[in-house]
């Protein structure tokens, strides 16, 4: 399955939208920083078969979509930007789902992939827990927004590596 160029452009658009969604300057929220321990090794496309990498990407975007689809998220962000952002993520999920179905037929996905998906889920659990602990404060959301921008940039790089493998 060839991930279309439009998928990468969609990821870029999602990053731009997420950047525009900010409401307070990150400079004002330095004290709220948190290390969510992004599972960087899961974004290293070299150690994965293509099917594994695509399912990790899918999980990453699915979890991001879920995070920004909550009521708390709706209250935190400007509605039209949030809708555009969610639409971009939804489109990417459709692209990736088509690829997952295609690729899983070609390759058997080993157990190692379940570990990778679990690592991504735990990462998002840490983010959700942080928001709960900080009572969904504006600065807590700002920290999370910056973190998701970072993780989306990792997934963009993984997509680039996948395209180079084709």
């Amino acid at each position: 399955c060839d991930l279309p160029q439009t998928h990468s452009l969609g990821n870029r658009r999602a990053l731009i939208l997420l950047g525009q969604m900010g409401r307070i300057s990150p400079f004002s929220c330095l004290k709220d920083r948190h290390d969510f321990r992004i599972p960087q090794e899961e974004f290293d496309g070299n150690q994965f078969q293509k099917a594994q990498a695509i399912s990790v990407l899918h999980e990453m975007i699915q979890q991001t979509f879920n995070l920004f689809s909550t009521e708390d998220s709706s209250a935190a962000w400007e509605q039209s930007l949030l809708e555009k952002f969610s639409t971009e993520l939804y489109q990417q999920l459709n692209d990736l789902e088509a690829c997952v179905i295609q690729e899983v037929g070609v390759e058997e996905t080993p157990l190692m992939n379940e570990d990778s998906i679990l690592a991504v889920r735990k990462y998002f659990q840490r983010i959700t827990l942080y928001l709960i602990e900080r009572k969904y404060s504006p600065c807590a959301w700002e920290v999370v927004r910056a973190e998701i921008m970072r993780s989306l940039s990792f997934s963009t790089n993984l997509q680039k590596r996948l395209r180079r493998k084709d």
Epitope: G19, Q20, G22, S25, P26, F27, L30, M149, S153
Partner: antibody, heavy 121, light 107 residues
Framework: QVQLVQSGAEVKKPGSSVKVSCKAS????????ISWVRQAPGQGLEWMGG????????NYAQKFQGRVTITADESTSTAYMELSSLRSEDTAVYYC??????????????WGQGTLVTVSS | DIQMTQSPSSLSASVGDRVTITCRAS??????LNWYQQKPGKAPKLLIY???SLQSGVPSRFSGSGSGTDFTLTISSLQPEDFATYYC?????????FGQGTKVEIK
């Protein structure tokens, strides 16, 4: 390769304004923070404020609030620092410094070459 | 504002010496401390971030430690190119503030 190239040296009269530019290349200009740091002759470093272009609003050190304006032009990947009501104590080398992409603006990873601003009557 | 105090303000040392510079914050800053090196007429260069993480490309003879209010920069074996001024900087809160600097000179 990340590069920050600043405008040339300036000589200004007390009471006037100066606008220093900082052109960035490498990385995605809109998504990282740029700060301005100054250094008076033989003195230490002083943070003036910073901006994240994609975000638009700048954050300033209280000391410079009302006298400094930091802006960014995404179309040219250039950040600007304008300091008004200049006095002799503002004579310094002014640096722009870039923070890491998609990270909180806490450390200065890349620096411009510096712009000497001399305030003298 | 958080005040950063470095000591000593200057020191003389020889090539091969072990050099230690300390930095104290006026309040707890967790591990949000960075160290920079500056040579005359040049822009500062990041050496250490988050108190003890070595910036990419920086020689391993540089190391940082500490948390809370007290921090240390150590150069395990001073090299000719290490003679410069060193600054600590807190990134716990704005305004971001620097120490006054420590000048490392040749003995």
């Amino acid at each position: 390769q990340v590069q920050l190239v600043q405008s040339g040296a300036e000589v200004k009269k007390p009471g006037s304004s100066v606008k220093v530019s900082c052109k960035a290349s490498g990385g995605t200009f809109s998504s990282y923070a740029i700060s301005w740091v100054r250094q008076a002759p033989g003195q230490g470093l002083e943070w003036m404020g910073g901006i994240i272009p994609i975000f638009g609003t700048a954050n300033y050190a209280q000391k410079f609030q009302g006298r400094v304006t930091i802006t960014a032009d995404e179309s040219t990947s250039t950040a600007y620092m304008e300091l008004s009501s200049l006095r002799s104590e503002d004579t310094a080398v002014y640096y722009c410094a870039r923070h890491l992409e998609y990270a909180f603006p806490d450390k200065f990873d890349y620096w411009g070459q510096g712009t000497l601003v001399t305030v003298s009557s | 504002d958080i005040q950063m105090t470095q000591s000593p303000s200057s020191l003389s040392a020889s090539v091969g010496d072990r050099v230690t510079i300390t930095c104290r914050a006026s309040q707890s800053i967790s591990s949000y401390l960075n160290w920079y090196q500056q040579k005359p007429g040049k822009a500062p260069k990041l050496l250490i971030y988050f108190a003890s993480s070595l910036q990419s490309g920086v020689p391993s003879r540089f190391s940082g430690s500490g948390s809370g209010t007290d921090f240390t920069l150590t150069i395990s074996s001073l090299q000719p190119e290490d003679f410069a001024t060193y600054y600590c900087q807190q990134s716990y809160s704005t305004p971001l503030t620097f120490g006054q600097g420590t000048k490392v000179e040749i003995k």
